[in-house]
C-alpha cells in the first residue's frame, strides 16, 4: 500500500523521550502518532477527489517540521504555515458549520448533510482530530510521556497553536451564511474563550460573510426556553453586529428529531418546530 511505501522510504525511528525529561501536565503524544497521521492522510486523499493530488509524505514532513526539535511552549502559527499550505482546501464557502462544545452532534449532522462541512471534515481537521502531539527542544524525539496543558503549562503548545491556526483559516474562508452549533446545556452557551469565540468569530470576513446563524442545541426534552435570549447569545450578537455581519438564532429543541429530519426531510412530523 501507499502507506507502507512511505514508511519504507523513511525508515523513521521515533524514540520516546526518556522519563527523566521534563514532565508536562497534559497527556503525551498519541500512540503511533506518525502512523496515524499518515494513514488518515492516505485515507482522506483517496476518498476526496479534490485532494487526490496531495502528497501525504510532504504533508507529514510539514506536520513534523512544525513541532519536532522545537520547544513545545514556543510554537508559532508560522511553524504550521507549510502544513496549512499543503492542506489548503477549497470547500464550498457557504456550507461551513462551526461548532462550540458540541462536536459530536456537529459531526453527526455533516455526516448526514453531506454538502456541509465542519473543520474536521477538511483534510487538516481530519488529520489531527482527537490527537495530541509534542516534541522537545533540540532533539528529533516525539514526547509520548507528556505534553503541555493549555492552562497549567502554556498556551503556545503544538496542539493549541495548530487548532488556532487551522480554525482561523477555516473562518477566513467562509462566505454568505455561516452556521454555528452551540451547546445550550452549558452555563456559557457562547464562550468568548472557546476557539469559536476567540478565533473564528473574529476571523469571519465581513466583505464575504452576510450572516452568522446560531443553532442553540437544547439538552433536556422538556426544555422549552428560548435560549436565543440567553445573555451570552446577546453578547455574540453584539460582537457579530459590530463586525457588520448580520446575526440570527434558532433553538433546536429536539436534537434527535433534528437529525432525523435532516435524514428524512419529507417526514410529516418535520414541519413542526424542532
Amino acid at each position: 500500500s501507499g502507506l507502507n511505501d512511505i514508511f519504507e522510504a523513511q525508515k523513521i525511528e521515533w524514540h520516546e523521550v526518556p522519563r527523566w525529561r521534563q514532565q508536562w501536565s497534559g497527556p503525551g503524544t498519541t500512540k503511533r502518532f506518525p502512523e496515524t497521521v499518515l494513514a488518515r492522510c492516505v485515507k482522506y486523499t483517496e476518498i476526496h477527489p479534490e485532494m487526490r493530488h496531495v502528497d501525504c509524505q510532504s504533508v507529514w514532513d510539514a506536520f513534523k517540521g512544525a513541532f519536532i526539535s522545537k520547544h513545545p511552549c514556543n510554537i508559532t502559527e508560522e511553524d504550521y504555515q507549510p502544513l496549512m499550505k499543503l492542506g489548503t482546501q477549497t470547500v464550498p464557502c457557504n456550507k461551513i458549520l462551526l461548532w462550540s462544545r458540541i462536536k459530536d452532534l456537529a459531526h453527526q449532522f455533516t455526516q448526514v448533510q453531506r454538502d456541509m462541512f465542519t473543520l474536521e471534515d477538511t483534510l487538516l481537521g481530519y488529520l489531527a482530530d482527537d490527537l495530541t502531539w509534542c516534541g522537545e527542544f533540540n532533539t528529533s524525539k516525539i514526547n509520548y510521556q507528556s505534553c503541555p496543558d493549555w492552562r497549567k503549562d502554556c498556551s503556545n503548545n503544538p496542539v493549541s497553536v495548530f487548532w488556532k491556526t487551522v480554525s482561523r483559516r477555516f473562518a477566513e474562508a467562509a462566505c454568505d451564511v455561516v452556521h454555528v452549533m452551540l451547546n445550550g446545556s452549558r452555563s456559557k452557551i457562547f464562550d468568548k474563550n472557546s476557539t469559536f469565540g476567540s478565533v473564528e468569530v473574529h476571523n469571519l470576513q465581513p466583505e464575504k460573510v452576510q450572516t452568522l446563524e446560531a443553532w442553540v442545541i437544547h439538552g433536556g426534552r422538556e426544555d422549552s426556553r428560548d435560549l436565543c435570549q440567553d445573555p451570552t447569545i446577546k453578547e455574540l450578537e453584539s460582537i457579530i453586529s459590530k463586525r457588520n455581519i448580520q446575526f440570527s438564532c434558532k433553538n433546536i429543541y429536539r436534537p434527535d428529531k433534528f437529525l432525523q429530519c435532516v435524514k428524512n426531510p419529507e417526514d410529516s412530523s418535520c414541519t413542526s418546530e424542532i
Partner: antibody, heavy 121, light 110 residues
Framework: EVQLLESGGGLVQPGGSLRLSCAAS????????IIWIRQAPGKGLEWVAA?????????YYADWAKGRFTVSKDNSKNTVYLQMNSLRAEDTAVYYC???????????????WGQGTLVTV | DIQLTQSPSTLSASVGDRVTITCRSS????????LAWYQQKPGKAPKLLMY???NLASGVPSRFSGSGSGTEFTLTISSVQPDDFATYYC??????????FGGGTKVEIK
C-alpha cells in the same frame, strides 16, 4: 533589493537532463516559498514545483511534474535547484523562479520573479 | 484538471479607453477570492498587479481594479495608458496549495 536569478538553461537532447539554479539575494530565504513556473514560447504560464525550508525541506509538485522533476535547496548558497530528467520537446520553455511569502495572507501569489532561463529540448 | 479561461484572448484599445478582462475558473478558488492578476511585457517576467481578487499590489496605479469571487473574476483598467499595453494573466490558488494560470489576454493598441 530583492533579486532572483535563474541559470542553467540551454539546449538539451530529448531524454536528456538539466539542472536549473535560482540564486536569491536581498531577502531572508527561509521565510519564502520558492516556486518554479514555466512558459512555453508564445504560450501561457504553468507552475512546476514549490519548496520551503524553515527547518527541513518541504516540497511539492504539479501532477505532471511528479517523477521527472525534482526541486531542492542549498540554504548556504541561497540557491534553489530544479533537476529535470527525461526531457521532452514539450518541456521547451522559459523557466522562472518566483517567491511567495510564507504567511496565510500572502500565500497563493508571486510578488517577485526572476528574469527566466530558456530550456530548449 | 483545473481550467482558468480568460476572455477575450486579444483586445484592441485606445489610450483612455476603459478595458475589462474576464477570468473564469472551472473550480472555485480557495477562500472564494484567492485570485491574482499579472502583467507581462515581451521578453520580461510577469509582474503582480492584484492579489486576493481586489487588492492592489504595491506600486500598481489605481486605474487597475479587480473584482469577483468564487469562479468569476474581472480585471478593469479604468483609463488605459501607453504603458498598459501588455499581456495579462489571471492565476488561481486551489486545494493542496496548487496553482493554475489563465491563457492570457493581450491588450494591444487599436
Amino acid at each position: 533589493e530583492v533579486q532572483l536569478l535563474e541559470s542553467g538553461g540551454g539546449l538539451v537532447q530529448p531524454g536528456g537532463s538539466l539542472r536549473l539554479s535560482c540564486a536569491a539575494s536581498g531577502f531572508s530565504f527561509n521565510n519564502y516559498w520558492i516556486i518554479w513556473i514555466r512558459q512555453a514560447p508564445g504560450k501561457g504560464l504553468e507552475w512546476v514545483a514549490a519548496i520551503y525550508s524553515p527547518s527541513g525541506d518541504i516540497k511539492y509538485y504539479a501532477d505532471w511534474a511528479k517523477g521527472r522533476f525534482t526541486v531542492s535547496k542549498d540554504n548556504s548558497k541561497n540557491t534553489v535547484y530544479l533537476q529535470m530528467n527525461s526531457l521532452r520537446a514539450e518541456d521547451t520553455a522559459v523557466y522562472y523562479c518566483a517567491r511567495e511569502l510564507a504567511g496565510s495572507s500572502y500565500e497563493g501569489y508571486f510578488e517577485s520573479w526572476g528574469q527566466g532561463t530558456l530550456v530548449t529540448v | 484538471d483545473i481550467q482558468l479561461t480568460q476572455s477575450p484572448s486579444t483586445l484592441s484599445a485606445s489610450v483612455g479607453d476603459r478595458v475589462t478582462i474576464t477570468c473564469r475558473s472551472s473550480q472555485s478558488v480557495y477562500g472564494h477570492n484567492w485570485l491574482a492578476w499579472y502583467q507581462q511585457k515581451p521578453g520580461k517576467a510577469p509582474k503582480l498587479l492584484m492579489y486576493r481578487a481586489s487588492n492592489l499590489a504595491s506600486g500598481v496605479p489605481s486605474r487597475f481594479s479587480g473584482s469577483g469571487s468564487g469562479t468569476e473574476f474581472t480585471l478593469t483598467i479604468s483609463s488605459v495608458q501607453p504603458d498598459d499595453f501588455a499581456t495579462y494573466y489571471c492565476q488561481g490558488y486551489y486545494s493542496g496549495g496548487s496553482y493554475a494560470f489563465g491563457g492570457g489576454t493581450k491588450v494591444e493598441i487599436k
